[in-house]
Interface confidence: medium
């Protein structure tokens, strides 16, 4: 029986050129997390495997940074980044838990907002 629940950052509005953090947390289960996949619609952004660590999809490696934790940082946002993002927790023995985040990227009228921040 799957007893876990996923809490997420929820719906986010951001400006073009900025950066956002996507975070999920799986609670209320003792299942072991073996891997977390981050997907945008049907596109794989990144994988965090318990044994192998992080893998960022080549098409996103310039704009996606792992962390904090099992979360994901998206940088240099474009309007095309608008849409649904999913954190998919692969666990044993429960199976798969999925959390959903909706991101809306808005046109920015302030050019200097494009600065990045660093995830240690």
């Amino acid at each position: 029986m799957m007893t876990g629940t996923i809490e997420t950052t929820g719906n986010i509005s951001a400006e073009k050129g900025g950066s956002i953090i996507l975070q999920c947390h799986l609670s209320s289960t003792t299942a072991q997390v073996t891997q977390v996949n981050w997907e945008q619609q049907d596109q794989l952004l990144a994988i965090c495997n318990a044994d192998l660590g992080w893998h960022i999809s080549p098409s996103f490696k310039d704009r996606v940074a792992p962390g904090p934790g099992l979360g994901l940082t998206l940088q240099s946002l474009t309007v095309n980044d608008t849409g649904e993002y999913f954190c998919i927790y692969h666990t044993y023995p429960d199976g798969t838990y999925t959390g959903r985040i909706f991101l809306e990227v808005l046109e920015s009228s302030v050019a200097e907002h494009g600065a990045r921040f660093q995830i240690p």
Partner: nanobody, 115 residues
Amino acid sequence: EVQLVESGGGLVQPGGSLRLSCAASGFTLSSNWMGWFRQAPGKEREFVASVLRGGYTWYADSVKGRFTISADNSKNTAYLQMNSLKPEDTAVYYCARDAYYYGLWGQGTLVTVSS
């Protein structure tokens, strides 16, 4: 008007403690993600800690076990308790909301760790 105002910074000796506050107005803190970031002179702004609505927290490796993030929904205020401070913690500390690093910044509060 939606606003975040940080306070609680100051000069402290190595090994000392400070508690930073981030007062929010214009939105309900309990319905949002909150985070603390910092920027040292000549460096990029970096993630320090964050907390989700339900209270789950994340920390940068450099502050784990020393810093604690929390939120008091009744006061619409987020906190960063900083213990065992080190000179390398010297920076301007900012809080942010909605997992969005410049969606809303306060003016920051300066923390200086020096003997």
